[in-house]
């Protein structure tokens, strides 16, 4: 019963985590304009992995996609790749884990096969979570580096009384969503791996059976039988990440007479 609960909970936690990773990947608020110097700006900038947006105080929001591959920073491409790999692995993991669930009966599938599949999905969830955490962390590191670089050159072109203030960017809501989602996927994966151990059939010790033949006595004692999972069933992966969540900024809708890409 505890095994089924652990497996079910692992599946649900991973499902939430992967949904979060997908949400974070699609979100536009990976980096948001730092409002420290101008808290009442009439123009608010924010950027995602796929497009950058500008929200005016008038309520009008304009988003522009990054219509180039080669012109984008290598780090951004790496983050995109990590997030996509995380989503793909997580999706495959979810698919495998559905069939591995103890509460679902598919034909005459043996417990050993279910244990195999549970472990496979668990490992996939762990890798998926790590990919998401890595992707978000790489982006966060990129932001921190750029933030301090732009702080160093905060005002460029101080010709007379004319100032050009550089826009600085800070952590957006998507980073926190990504960290939490990656952590949940990782936890779900660990739970699946733990559940796998309970699913694997225990070592069965059969009592010795004596066969009496005429003339001489032969005792037949079969050795202990152990189900092979195809993986090391004693795998213990207890790497757990716990992130903090922050809600996304409210975006006003605006009746637009134009249609922007």
């Amino acid at each position: 019963m505890a095994v089924t609960a652990c497996q079910g909970l692992g599946f649900v936690v991973s499902l939430i985590g992967i949904a979060g990773i997908i949400a974070a990947t699609c979100m536009d608020q990976w980096s948001t304009q730092d409002l420290y110097n101008n808290p009442v700006t009439a123009v608010f900038n924010y950027q995602g992995l796929w497009r950058s947006c500008v929200r005016e105080s008038s309520g009008f929001t304009e988003c522009r996609g990054y219509f180039t591959l080669l012109g984008l920073p290598a780090m951004l491409q790496a983050v995109r790749a990590l997030m996509i790999v995380g989503i793909v692995l997580g999706a495959i993991g979810l698919l495998v884990s559905i069939f591995a669930l103890k509460c679902i009966r598919i034909g005459s599938m043996e417990d050993s096969a279910k244990a195999n599949m549970t472990l496979t999905s668990g490992i996939m969830f762990i890798v998926s979570g790590l990919c998401a955490i890595a992707g978000v962390s790489v982006f966060a590191n990129m932001l921190v580096t750029n933030f301090w670089m732009s702080t160093a050159n905060m005002y460029t072109g101080m010709g007379g009384m004319v100032q050009t203030v550089q826009t600085r960017y800070t952590f957006g809501a998507a980073l926190f969503v990504g960290w939490v989602a990656g952590g949940l996927t990782l936890i779900g994966g660990v739970m699946m791996c733990i559940a796998c151990r309970g699913l694997a059939p225990e070592e069965t010790n059969y009592k010795a059976v004596s066969y009496h033949a005429s003339g001489h006595s032969v005792a037949y004692k079969p050795g202990g039988f152990k189900a092979s999972t195809g993986f090391g069933s004693n795998t213990k992966n207890k790497k757990i990440y716990d992130g903090g969540a922050r809600t996304e900024d409210e975006v006003q809708s605006y009746p637009s007479k134009h249609d922007y890409v």
């Epitope: 304009q33 101008n38 009442v40 700006t41 009439a42 123009v43 900038n45 924010y46 950027q47 950058s52 947006c53 500008v54 005016e56 105080s57 008038s58 309520g59 009008f60 304009e62 522009r64 004319v162 100032q163 050009t164 203030v165 550089q166 826009t167 409210e250 006003q252 809708s253 605006y254 009746p255 134009h258």
Partner: antibody, heavy 118, light 113 residues
């Protein structure tokens, strides 16, 4: 057709109060941010206050902060400006205006004159 | 606060000629996020409220004649009226639309020679 009509102006004693109204019609009132802008021959156009479509955020010019309060009643399609502790320098023609693309004001009312004098 | 400086204060013109007026801001109005300049131009005739002419420094509002052209970037902006008509005689204001408080220039008055 978009229409903004201000009312509530008049002669007020220094230190007194006044509430201006702006009745809107011809557009989805609750979908737009709105402003109060005033004009004097000496100072020209001066932005006073802004209220977003959802009533938050609200911004004020430093010259009126703490004395003026902007508010809106979306069901009634009305914008308000409550003015207190009025000074002679608050004497102006007060316009309400609709916020538009590029943070511009695309529609203005005809204005209401507020005179602060003894 | 961003200070808007308009020049000249007065402009005397004859019908049909090309007119150029300037607006300078104390801080750049160019937003890096969308590469748009947050500067607006208005026209005000006596006894009337201001009328929106141009936003985003160069985007003409619908219904505005194409003889009105806005240009410039960063801190220096220009409003050009090609072939001035009698109905164009008015006060022209530029406005900072980049950050609060939203500030206006003192205006350029277009007068007939």
């Amino acid at each position: 057709d978009v229409q903004l009509v201000e009312s509530g102006g008049g002669l007020v004693q220094p230190g007194g109060s006044r509430k201006l109204s702006c009745a809107a019609s011809g557009f989805s009132f609750s979908g737009f941010g709105l402003h109060w802008i005033r004009q004097t021959p000496e100072k020209g156009l001066e932005w006073v206050a802004y209220i977003s479509s959802g009533s938050r955020p609200i911004y004020y010019a430093d010259t009126v902060k703490g004395r003026f309060t902007i508010s809106r009643d979306n069901p009634k399609n009305t914008l308000f400006l409550q003015m207190t502790s009025l000074r002679s320098e608050d004497t102006a023609m007060y316009f309400c205006a609709r916020f538009y693309f590029g943070n511009s004001f695309d529609h203005w009312g005809q204005g209401t004159l507020v005179t602060v004098s003894t | 606060d961003i200070v808007m400086t308009q020049s000249p204060s007065f402009l005397t013109v004859t019908a049909g000629e090309k007119v150029t007026m300037s607006c300078r801001s104390s801080q750049s109005l160019l937003n890096s996020g969308n590469q748009r300049n947050y500067l607006t131009w208005y026209q005000q005739k006596p006894g009337q409220p201001p009328k929106l002419l141009i936003y985003w420094a160069s985007t003409r509002e619908s219904g505005v004649p194409d003889r009105f052209t806005g240009s410039g970037s960063g801190t220096d902006f220009t409003l050009t009226i090609n072939s001035v008509q009698a109905e164009d005689l008015a006060l022209y204001y530029c406005q900072n639309a980049y950050s609060f408080p939203l500030t206006f220039g003192a205006g350029t008055k277009l007068e007939l020679k």
